[in-house]
Every structure is written in structure tokens, then in C-alpha cells.
């Protein structure tokens, strides 16, 4: 029997520093967790006292924080060097920038492979791009080899930025002749390293003949087998064992997210590479584990160039931007407004000519916006700014939801009104109308949206059996604020780019901007 | 009900051979791992060797290797434990035990056959 | 191989009583533990199962904890079709081992 040691990552998001419990700005040192300083420290710790060892990444390094907004990705590939990771898979996320913010930044400056197998160049970019990422690799490991075979959602046309030389394959129909060309090679032992989500994980376990581990990404998934060490509630075992269509056991493995954690998976192979044995568990990398002095000093050092950043002016506004809970809790305000235009405008994919775009929606709760900006101070826009309006560090997202699962958003929005709760909803792509004269959960008298099969955009009534498309926070898709219909009937959630760097990149697009209020909410005559 | 019927059982000599089987019904055989464990008279359990669920895959204990042969049949749902060149240590009652499916660990055991190995 | 040292070997304990009785692994093995129940003539049954977890149909009496290499069973109030030897027993790694076992007694 051979024992392999696999270390993973996923959902990094650019946290490259320590971060709070929640994965947001660290505030009290003690108390924080993460970063890579930290993550060095636990894998070198394992490295010296582990032979076969893997530090595996399953994607979605890019985006997250003020680091990527200003590296764009040279950070990824600096920290990631330093840190002697293995292999990484392509995520949705590495192509935010387009395929030069990946090439240039990232695969090109990489000492480790890059891989995903179900991304296919064409064009022009085929040869460019040959050889920077790879569908598999064979790394040595003591004595023996492993193949790492890569995969990335498919669905990332419409949650990035690929361009149209990329074509996105079926994850399962792609890997199988990886997988099979590697067994040619005589490899027998082989890892699908992908960011997919768990439930393609999961099937990629059980119908990819030949994997015998799937270490995956996308979806967040925490998994834990005995008492959890902290805030996140495990989704299943760790590993989670898949027994796959040709009666094997595959150990699926995820590491929640933020670099909160590092997987640590232990896999015992027969002599034939079938596994026979697995088990571990994520650690919680908290300020028990001492964070590097050397990979310190020199996040310290990319630091300064950040605080800079921050106050240099991004565009201007000549409007007041009314984000006061006076306004955002109560009614339409033009913050809102503005901050639903640039989380649509953030995710404009021409993906069909059938299509204008996939997504026309936002909605956005009022009490997740924090401060107004003032256009009096030369109409200057900061990332400081921005921080105030937006401090807890979200993301937008892209869910798809029911009619039905809308309306009942809407009559929560509203259901207590007046006592300047944050459930309030701005919105964009939408025109609502409350009666709030009529009893809570009632109140809803129309609700209009913005179509997206059309070449002219117009407002239709919503229907309660269609399934719409959907901007929003990270906090709206879990539920916050008391959207439990939202967390409960959601059909699908993808997680997208950091919140500021949404509106930031808005605001820099359009370098003057007056967003109004104009009509979106309103309420109907007697009730306010 | 999950049921595993061990048979096969008896007194052997020093050096001779035995075949024990294992009848297993209640769920389907041909998808789970399965395992033989034994254990001397008045002493602890030890595991002897592991099969899985195609057949492709054995393993044994230092103690047996060489020895035993571990060997299923799908079709008849049983497994089965070929013993040869026994030895006065051999002497024990074996149990055959499932691997749960979604894990590592035996969730369903035999009532045990006793093996006796003496002159 | 992986060593499991169970302690005590043997314990005399009444009816009601909290009994607990401790596997130590010569190595870090997670939660690969499972904790089994033999009484005499009988096949093992299987009571606790990845260190913590309750096999379903045993009693809630029944509890496992630990990770690493230090785990533990308890029962919180003994009963009568309690007393029975115990084994813990790793799946971290091949070959697969057990403790050497826990007899509980009556007093």
C-alpha cells in the first residue's frame, strides 16, 4: 500500500491576508484566521512530517478583495510560487478580467500547472494560449506518479468573462478521455482537481471511469466528519465517499472557502492504484497556528501599494448618492439604483443572439447599504468611499429563482414597513408597486420585470411559474435579512465578484455618473 | 434484513487446507466491499483480508499473506476464503463482515465458523 | 501498523453507572474509529462509527468522541444488555486493526 497526502484549496478569493471568522477584514489579530502567511506555516508543517505530499488548489484564487482589484492576478501567481503549490485548476472567476487578465498575470508567470480539461482555445487564441494551461498532468510524488486531470464549470460563459475562443465542455465528457489517456500512460492513480461545484463532483465520482479522488470547488461546500471547530455546518462527511457506476469508492473532498481552511486528505492506494483507505479532515487555520515571518514580510510589502490605491479617485459623481437608511430603508433611493445598474452592467454577457443578456434583474437589500456619498467634495469617488457604502465584503451574486420565489421576496420586503428594517429592496430590472394599506403579505399590487428574450428591453408582468435570472448579495442568496424563501427555493446559486470592486469598476467604466430616482418602487394612492 | 452466513468451519490438521464461505442475502452483494476477520479463543479481533466488490482488488494480513485467498462469486452472493498450509495459530472463529458503502468501516457482521487447527 | 490500546482492559460497573472507556492510536487517524460491541458467542455490532457518529438503532446512551489519535466511548447509563467486551478499531489504514478490547462487567 502507498499513503498519499493531499492539501487543497478553493474559493481562495483573494484572501490573501488574514481575515475576521467570517472571512471578512481582519479587525482583532488574535482572533483571526487564514491568509497565505498562515496557510504556509500548516503546509510546511505537513510537508516535513508527510512523505507524499500534494498542495492542490480547485480554483477561484481571483476576485474578492482591494488585492486582486489592484494585482489582478500577479498576486495569485507570486503567493501561490512561494507557497510550492502542486497544481491548480481553472475557475470561473480566473477569467473576470478576460483571457489576457488570465494569460498574462497568471499562466505565464505560474511555476506550477494550470489545468482544466473541458476548456477547449479555438481560433486565434489556440495558439497563444497552447501550452499555458493543460487538460492533465503527471507529477512525481515519492516514488511513484499522479495524474491530476482538470475541470471548470461550464456554466463559466455566464458568470465570466472567457470571450468567445473558449468553448466550455460537459465536465464528464471531456475528462473521460483525459482520464483514459492517462491509464494509457500507465498511471493509475489519479485526481480530478475541478471547480464545478459539489453536486458535478460528485458525479464526475461516479461516472469518470478511472478517478480515484475528486477534489473540488465552486460551491463553497464544507465538509466535516466529527465536531465542527467553527461558524460553518458541514454539508456532508469528510471525505464524502462516492461509490461510482464501476463499483469503487471515491473519496470527494471540498474546503469550504476563503482560505479558512486547508483540506487535509489521506489516501492509502493498493498496489493497483485503487484506493482502499481515506480519511482526514479540513484545519481550521486559526491563530493557534503561527503565521510565517518571511511570507509576513512580504505581503507587508505588496501591502503599500493597496492603501494607496484606496484613495485614488475612481470617477465622479455631480448627484448626491443617497444611501442614508432614512431613504434606502423606506423607498427607492438612487444609491440603490446606482449599485443595481453596475451589478447588471457587471454581468452584460451577449452569450445568445436570441437574448439582449441572461440576467436583467437585481434586487438588493436596503439595509445592506451602509453610507451616502456626497457629491460636494469635487465629486470624487474613492474605494474609501465605496468601503463605507459597502463594508462588509460581499459579493453579488447569480441565482435563479421562480416568480413565485420573487413575489414572495417582494411581499417580505415590505411585510413590516415603517420600522425602518433592512429587508427594504432596491431594485433594478424591476417595477414594483406596494399597497401598503392592504394586510402584510398582501401588499404586492404589481410587479413588472425586464425581459431578457427580446431585442428591445420592456417591462412584463412577472409569472409566478417562470424561472427568472437574478442579481443579488451573497446575504440575500443565504437567507439574511429573513429571505428564508430566497435560501429555501433558490434553483441555482453562483457565487460572483467582491461588491465593491462591482461598483468600483462601474463607476471607473463611466467616469461621470447621476443616477436618479426614477420610478422603480413605487407605492399606490392612499397608502403613503 | 442484511444476513452473512459463514460455513466451511471444522478441525483441520497442521499444514492441511479448508475453504470457508460466506452466504450473504438482504442487500445487493456485488456492490459492497467485504472483509474476514478472526479471532482466537478468549482473544481479541484481528483482521485477515479484504476483497472489492468486483473482485479486482485483495489485500491480507503479514500473518496469512501467501496463505489465504480471499475470492467472491456475484452471482451466487457469496464470498468465500480459501486457507491453506494452516497452522496451530490459524485456530479461531472467522467472521465475514460488510464494508459500508459510503465508508470505511464494517457494518454488518456473520455469526462466525470455527477453525481448529490441531493433530 | 497502526497500534490501538484500549483502557481500561477490564471494569466492574453497576446498573445506571456512566462508564467510559478510552482507545489511544500509536498514530493521527482522524476520525477513522468505529467501536464495536461483542458479547459472548456472538458477532461484533457495530455501535459508533466515524469516532462520533451513532450507528442507527443504537441507543443514545451510546456516544463517541475524540480525533487523532485519542478517542473515547461512554455509556451514559448502563443497563443490564450493556455488560459485553468493546473494541475500537481504526480504517484510517491497512492493515486494519482493533483495540484489544474493554470487558464490562457487573459489580
Known amino acids: 500500500a502507498w499513503e498519499l497526502t493531499i492539501l487543497h484549496t478553493n474559493d481562495v478569493h483573494s484572501r490573501l491576508e488574514q481575515t475576521s471568522e467570517d472571512s471578512s477584514k481582519c479587525v482583532n489579530a488574535s482572533r483571526c484566521m487564514g491568509g497565505v502567511a498562515r496557510l504556509f506555516t500548516k503546509v510546511q508543517q505537513i510537508r516535513r512530517a508527510e512523505p507524499n505530499v500534494l498542495l492542490l488548489d480547485a480554483g477561484d484564487q481571483y476576485q474578492g478583495t482591494i488585492w486582486f482589484t489592484v494585482y489582478k492576478g500577479a498576486e495569485v501567481a507570486h503567493f501561490m510560487n512561494a507557497l510550492r503549490y502542486d497544481a491548480m485548476a481553472l475557475g470561473n472567476h480566473e477569467f473576470d478580467n478576460g483571457v489576457e487578465g488570465l494569460i498574462e498575470p497568471l499562466l505565464k508567470e505560474a511555476k506550477f500547472p494550470i489545468l482544466s480539461a473541458n476548456i477547449k482555445a479555438k481560433g486565434p487564441l489556440a495558439s497563444q494560449i497552447s501550452g499555458l494551461y493543460l487538460p492533465y498532468k503527471v507529477l512525481p510524488v515519492g516514488d511513484e506518479v499522479v495524474g491530476i486531470v482538470g475541470y471548470t464549470s461550464k456554466e463559466t460563459p455566464f458568470l465570466s468573462n472567457p470571450g468567445t475562443n473558449l468553448v466550455f465542455e460537459d465536465e464528464i465528457t471531456a475528462l473521460q478521455p483525459e482520464v483514459d489517456k492517462l491509464k494509457t500512460l500507465n498511471v493509475n492513480k489519479i485526481i480530478a482537481l475541478g471547480h464545478s461545484g459539489f453536486e458535478m463532483d460528485k458525479l464526475i465520482a461516479q461516472k469518470v471511469r478511472g478517478v480515484d479522488v475528486v477534489v473540488g470547488g465552486h460551491s463553497n461546500t464544507f465538509l466535516y466528519t466529527g465536531n465542527p471547530p467553527s461558524k460553518e455546518v458541514p454539508a456532508g462527511k469528510y471525505p464524502f465517499i462516492v461509490t461510482s457506476d464501476d463499483g469503487r469508492k471515491v473519496p470527494v473532498v471540498q474546503a469550504y472557502a476563503f482560505g479558512k481552511y486547508l483540506g487535509y486528505l489521506k489516501i492509502e492506494f493498493d498496489e493497483r492504484g485503487n484506493v482502499i483507505s481515506s480519511h482526514g479532515n479540513p484545519i481550521l487555520l486559526n491563530s493557534s497556528i503561527p503565521e510565517d515571518p518571511s511570507i509576513k514580510a512580504d505581503i507587508n510589502k505588496w501591502r503599500i501599494k493597496l492603501d494607496n490605491y484606496s484613495t485614488q479617485e475612481l470617477g465622479k459623481t455631480i448627484v448626491y448618492l443617497d444611501g442614508s437608511s432614512q431613504s434606502c430603508r423606506f423607498r427607492e433611493c438612487n444609491m440603490g439604483n446606482l449599485i443595481c445598474d453596475a451589478m447588471i452592467n457587471n454581468n452584460l454577457r451577449h452569450t445568445d443572439e436570441m437574448f439582449w443578456n441572461h440576467v436583467s434583474m437585481c434586487i438588493l437589500n436596503g439595509g445592506g447599504i451602509r453610507s451616502p456619498i456626497d457629491e460636494r467634495n469635487n465629486g470624487t469617488i474613492t474605494w474609501e468611499n465605496l468601503a463605507a457604502v459597502l463594508p462588509f465584503g460581499g459579493t453579488f451574486d447569480l441565482v435563479q429563482l421562480k416568480g413565485s420565489t420573487l413575489k414572495k421576496a417582494f411581499e417580505h420586503s415590505v411585510h413590516r414597513y415603517g420600522q425602518s428594517t433592512g429587508e427594504f429592496l432596491q431594485v433594478g430590472g424591476i417595477h414594483v408597486v406596494y399597497d401598503l394599506s392592504r394586510k402584510p403579505g398582501d401588499r404586492v399590487v404589481k410587479l413588472d420585470v425586464l425581459c431578457t428574450k427580446c431585442r428591445v428591453p420592456s417591462y412584463d408582468p412577472l409569472k409566478m411559474d417562470e424561472v427568472y435570472k437574478v442579481i443579488l448579495p451573497n446575504f440575500l442568496a443565504n437567507g439574511g435579512d429573513g429571505f428564508q424563501m430566497i435560501k429555501d427555493e433558490l434553483l441555482r446559486h453562483d457565487s460572483g465578484d467582491q461588491d465593491i470592486n462591482v461598483v468600483s469598476t462601474y463607476i471607473s467604466k463611466m467616469k461621470v455618473i447621476y443616477p436618479a430616482v426614477e420610478g422603480r418602487i413605487k407605492f399606490s394612492t392612499g397608502s403613503h | 434484513e442484511v444476513q452473512l452466513v459463514e460455513s466451511g468451519g471444522g478441525l483441520v490438521q497442521p499444514g492441511g487446507s479448508l475453504r470457508l464461505s460466506c452466504a450473504a442475502s438482504g442487500f445487493t452483494f456485488s456492490s459492497y466491499w467485504m472483509h474476514w476477520v478472526r479471532q482466537a479463543p478468549g482473544k481479541g479481533l484481528v483482521w485477515v483480508s479484504r476483497?472489492?466488490?468486483?473482485?479486482?482488488?485483495?489485500g491480507y494480513a503479514d500473518s496469512v499473506k501467501g496463505r489465504f485467498t480471499i475470492s467472491r462469486d456475484n452471482a451466487k452472493n457469496t464470498l468465500y476464503l480459501q486457507m491453506n498450509s494452516l497452522r496451530a495459530e490459524d485456530t479461531a472463529v472467522y467472521y465475514c463482515?460488510?464494508?459500508?458503502?459510503?465508508?470505511?468501516?464494517?457494518?454488518?457482521w456473520g455469526q462466525g465458523t470455527l477453525v481448529t487447527v490441531s493433530s | 501498523a497502526i497500534q490501538l490500546t484500549q483502557s481500561p482492559s477490564s471494569l466492574s460497573a453497576s446498573v445506571g453507572d456512566r462508564v467510559t472507556i478510552t482507545c489511544r492510536a500509536s498514530q493521527g487517524i482522524s476520525s477513522a474509529l468505529a467501536w464495536y460491541q461483542q458479547k459472548p458467542g456472538k458477532a461484533p455490532k457495530l455501535l459508533i462509527y466515524d469516532a462520533s457518529s451513532l450507528e442507527s438503532g443504537v441507543p443514545s446512551r451510546f456516544s463517541g468522541s475524540g480525533s487523532g489519535t485519542d478517542f473515547t466511548l461512554t455509556i451514559s447509563s448502563l443497563q443490564p444488555e450493556d455488560f459485553a467486551t468493546y473494541y475500537c478499531q481504526q480504517f484510517s489504514s491497512y492493515p486494519r486493526t482493533f483495540g484489544q478490547g474493554t470487558k464490562v462487567e457487573i459489580k
Open positions: 463482515a460488510r464494508e459500508f458503502s459510503s465508508g470505511w468501516y464494517f457494518d454488518y
Open positions: 476483497i472489492i466488490s468486483d473482485g479486482s482488488s485483495t
